[in-house]
């Protein structure tokens, strides 16, 4: 008989090497039975995990598993670090292993900004 506990299938010490400026999806594989749990992402800062409140997330449902996705539009150098997803299920908090993003910044900070960047700097966003 299959367990009906919520399970988060992030492998221990999983990591992703990605380029700054590209889109990226960080997936938290979630197994549940009847009711989909409330899942959140957080980023590790020392011993605490800071909840990512204002970030785009979405659910992708597949036959035997669901994915809670954290979207990066785009990946930025300061997205480098370790992330964890956690699920609230029947008053229990279930935490995943952490997964680490290694962000390579191909456009070094010493590079001269492009005309687009200079023209639009007042409206440039950062996180």
């Amino acid at each position: 008989k299959e367990s009906c506990d919520v399970q988060l299938y992030i492998k221990r010490q999983s990591e992703h090497s990605i380029l700054a400026g590209d889109p990226f999806e960080l997936e938290c594989p979630v197994k549940y039975c009847a009711n989909r749990p409330h899942v959140t992402w957080c980023k590790l800062n020392g011993t605490t995990c800071v909840k990512l409140e204002d970030r785009q997330t979405s659910w992708k449902e597949e036959k035997n598993i669901s994915f809670f996705i954290l979207h990066f539009e785009p990946v930025l150098p300061n997205d480098n670090g370790s992330y964890r997803c956690s699920a609230n299920f029947q008053s229990n908090l279930i935490e995943s292993h952490s997964t680490t993003l290694y962000v390579t910044d191909v456009k070094s900070a010493s590079e001269r900004p492009s005309k687009d960047e200079m023209a639009s700097r007042p409206w440039l966003l950062y996180r």
Epitope: E25, S114, D116, Y126
Partner: antibody, heavy 125, light 108 residues
């Protein structure tokens, strides 16, 4: 003037291949994510694929494994290689400019703010 | 994926009237990543609103966007003859970058 000019549509048999091109001008092409969006006759808009400034890609499930998005920043060009074409791929295909990534942690994401004129892909036996 | 549902499917109004178009998401969308487009027959879509409420360059101030979470609205305060077209909402916060099915705004 900021613009995207498309080429490469046409008639192809089911199972055939086609390559679409999109040339950008008037902006720093290499700093922008680029998208392909399609519109079947009389239907709404459907997102197809995206490629980031660094070459990272994502695809709609309906085209995954059959379509390949690529870019040549030296030529300010975006491409969509379409293989194993099906009747349901018949549509007008648009290229569109996505978010801007500068350097460090600066970016701007205004959605798809510049569009090509569209090119028609007809799949018929 | 995030499904966007637009209503009404067709809206019949006269020039000078106010148009209110709705877009509802199946999952929460960060308001930073909700856009509205206008499309006329035989033309490419044109960006009107990004970030749920910011007007794109060159868009007249009769167009405004609002909303957050799962409910978003595009309002055209006083319809001009050139505003009759199809309007699409889109979430662009991540793949797949879904569009609503469109609202056709037609002359009454």
């Amino acid at each position: 003037e900021v613009q995207l000019v498309q080429s490469g549509g046409g008639l192809v048999h089911p199972g055939g291949s086609l390559r679409l091109s999109c040339a950008g001008s008037g902006f720093t092409f290499s700093s922008y994510a680029m998208h392909w969006v399609r519109q079947a006759p009389g239907k709404g808009l459907e997102w197809v694929s995206v490629i980031g400034p660094g070459g990272g890609t994502y695809y709609a499930d309906s085209v995954k494994g059959r379509f390949t998005i690529s870019r040549d920043n030296a030529k300010n060009s975006l491409y969509l290689q379409m293989n194993s074409l099906r009747a349901e791929d018949m549509a007008v295909y648009f290229c569109a400019r996505g978010y801007y990534y500068g350097s460090g942690n600066f970016f701007k994401n205004y959605g798809m703010d510049v569009w090509g004129q569209g090119t028609t892909v007809t799949v018929s036996s | 994926e995030i499904v966007l549902t637009q209503s009404p499917g067709t809206l019949s109004l006269s020039p000078g009237e106010r148009a209110t178009l709705s877009c509802r998401a199946s999952q929460s969308v960060s308001s930073s990543y909700l856009a509205w487009y206008q499309q006329k027959p035989g033309q490419a879509p044109r960006l009107l609103i990004y970030g749920a409420s910011s007007r794109a360059t060159g868009i007249p101030d009769r167009f405004s966007g609002s909303g957050s979470g799962t409910d978003f609205t595009l309002t055209i305060s006083r319809l001009e003859p050139e505003d009759f077209a199809v309007y699409y909402c889109q979430q662009y916060g991540g793949s797949p970058y879904t569009f609503g099915q469109g609202t056709k705004l037609q002359i009454k």
